[in-house]
Interface confidence: medium
């Protein structure tokens, strides 16, 4: 029988109000709201935490009955969307001690592990795996890529009694190892003998010049000559002008520095490599995995461009579990989102379509009335002229 | 601690331009520019990151536009075809990011009337 420790799928209505407390820890935090955006695969089910001001800290929590992973799994799973096309912010999730006091908790508040999805720019696409180990917060030592699409996401991590983790998005494994090779919590296992230094006589040169080569007498030969085919301009007044020089022009004959053969070093060792030994510092710690109080997820994130939506938590010591409930939320509603992103899409379209059709319509229904016009006041000007022919004869009989 | 300095609003006519800009003392991964109009929510309008890729709010694209001196340390909005609905208090932000850890800073905020 699995263990569920926490599980939110916001199906209650304002119910959440009561199970997630806000901090006070700044008066300006960002709020959340319960919506399942502007397009989803069901308004129901796919309601969530939606970050709704943009430019905002948010720091939401909900506690949970204290529990310890020792000696058994630890899965984290939420799904997250950030249908706002974001730039910049967190979509990550924050694992507390019951210690935390919910109401002042902020950026600074310790945690025992970090997971999930970031974006910052170009720069930063990673999910964080960030482990609290003896105080201090430790990141992997590798690049995990995260979504950064428009469409609901299902992120899990799992830490397992054995000190191995895995990292799955949409069901699927991304990252999976050991946690002391993947996190440096540990000093490594081997040091470089500080007793051991390359020996002097030690040859780490490949080639060597060959001893036998010598330059050969007719090398020298200067980089730049006078212009052989240069002839002083007749008009040249060595008084005025000086004494004449010819242009210097490259010496087809200059060879560059000689530089004797290379040969195979008969005394090369190869690259001395410095040996290893074992550690002092080092003891394996076979509890990294392990902490004695998990009580309180939390969010604490930042965002440029609101609109995020956190949904389908779930804390369980179950992998099966986690991956049917997963398969149940996200992957019941992920074909029926899309399907409706994308009749927004093609609505979006046309629409922009029949908007260009009817101002490329106006624009030469106005063009067209601007060459009536035009056309008009050309013959109007025709007549005035016509008239004014005729006028000219009629004025000068009546002088006369 | 990083300090921002914002400069260049005021009033200007319906069509008219105006360039704020922001100087910032201190390391920035992005700079952004926001606005609040009275009796309204602070609204984004364009950020800038490091990398370079830029994005604007769809109330200001092809109007506004952003752009950054490195060696001033300084992010500039220039403010073309403004419209009445432009009026706000426009704040510039920068954000410093470390691991999953986000300090931002705020400018005091400048000014911009759009009116006839």
């Known amino acids: 029988e699995p263990a569920v420790y926490f599980k939110e799928q916001f199906l209650d209505g304002d119910g959440w109000t009561s199970r997630w407390i806000e901090s006070k820890h700044k008066s300006d935090f960002g709020k959340f709201v319960l919506s399942s955006g502007k397009f989803y695969g069901d308004e129901e089910k796919d309601k969530g935490l939606q970050t709704s001001q943009d430019a905002r800290f948010y720091a939401l929590s909900a506690s949970f009955e204290p529990f310890s992973n020792k000696g058994q799994t630890l899965v984290v799973q939420f799904t997250v969307k950030h249908e706002q096309n974001i730039d910049c912010g967190g979509g990550y999730v924050k694992l507390f001690p019951n210690s935390l006091d919910q109401t002042d908790m902020h950026g600074d508040s310790e945690y025992n592990i970090m997971f999930g999805p970031d974006i910052c720019g170009p720069g930063t696409k990673k999910v964080h795996v960030i482990f609290n180990y003896k105080g201090k917060n430790v990141l992997i030592n590798k690049d995990i890529r995260c979504k950064d699409d428009e469409f609901t996401h299902l992120y899990t991590l799992i830490v397992r009694p054995d000190n191995t983790y895995e990292v799955k998005i949409d069901n699927s494994q991304v990252e999976s190892g050991s946690l002391e090779d993947d996190w440096d919590f540990l000093p490594p296992k081997k040091i470089k003998d500080p007793d051991a230094s390359k020996p002097e006589d030690w040859d780490e040169r490949a080639k060597i010049d060959d001893p036998t080569d010598s330059k050969p007498e007719d090398w020298d030969k200067p980089e730049h000559i006078p212009d052989p085919d240069a002839k002083k301009p007749e008009d040249w007044d060595e008084e005025m002008d000086g004494e004449w020089e010819p242009p210097v022009i490259q010496n087809p004959e200059y060879k560059g520095e000689w530089k004797p053969r290379q040969i195979d070093n008969p005394d090369y060792k190869g690259t001395w490599i410095h040996p290893e030994i074992d550690n002092p510092e080092y003891s394996p710690d076979p509890s990294i995995y392990a902490y004695d109080n998990f009580g309180v997820l939390g969010l604490d994130l930042w965002q440029v461009k609101s609109g995020t939506i956190f949904d389908n938590f779930l804390i369980t010591n179950d992998e099966a579990y986690a991956e049917e409930f997963g398969n149940e939320t996200w992957g019941v509603t992920k074909a029926a989102e899309k399907q409706m992103k994308d009749k927004q899409d093609e609505e979006q379209r046309l629409k922009e379509e029949e908007e260009d059709k009817k101002r490329k319509e106006e624009e030469e229904a106005e063009d067209k009335e601007d060459d009536e016009d035009k056309d008009e006041d050309e013959e109007d000007e025709e007549d005035k002229e016509e008239d004014e022919e005729e006028d000219v004869p009629g004025q000068a009989k009546d002088e006369l | 601690q990083v300090q921002l300095q914002e400069s260049g609003g005021g009033l200007v006519q319906p069509g008219g331009s105006l360039r704020l800009s922001c100087t910032a003392s201190?390391?920035?991964?992005?700079f952004g520019w926001y606005r609040q109009a009275p009796g309204k929510q602070r609204e984004f309008v364009a950020n800038?990151?490091?990398?370079?890729?830029?994005r604007y709010s769809d109330s200001v694209k092809g109007r506004f536009t952003i752009s950054k001196d490195n060696a001033k340390n300084t992010a500039y909005l220039q403010m073309n075809i403004l419209k009445p609905e432009d009026t706000a208090v426009y704040y510039c932000?920068?954000?410093?990011?470390?691991?999953?850890?986000?300090?931002?800073?705020w400018g005091q905020g400048t000014q911009v009337t759009v009116s006839s």
């Open positions: 932000n920068a954000l410093v990011r470390f691991e999953g850890r986000n300090d931002d800073y």
């Open positions: 800038m990151y490091v990398g370079g890729s830029i």
């Open positions: 201190g390391s920035i991964a992005a």
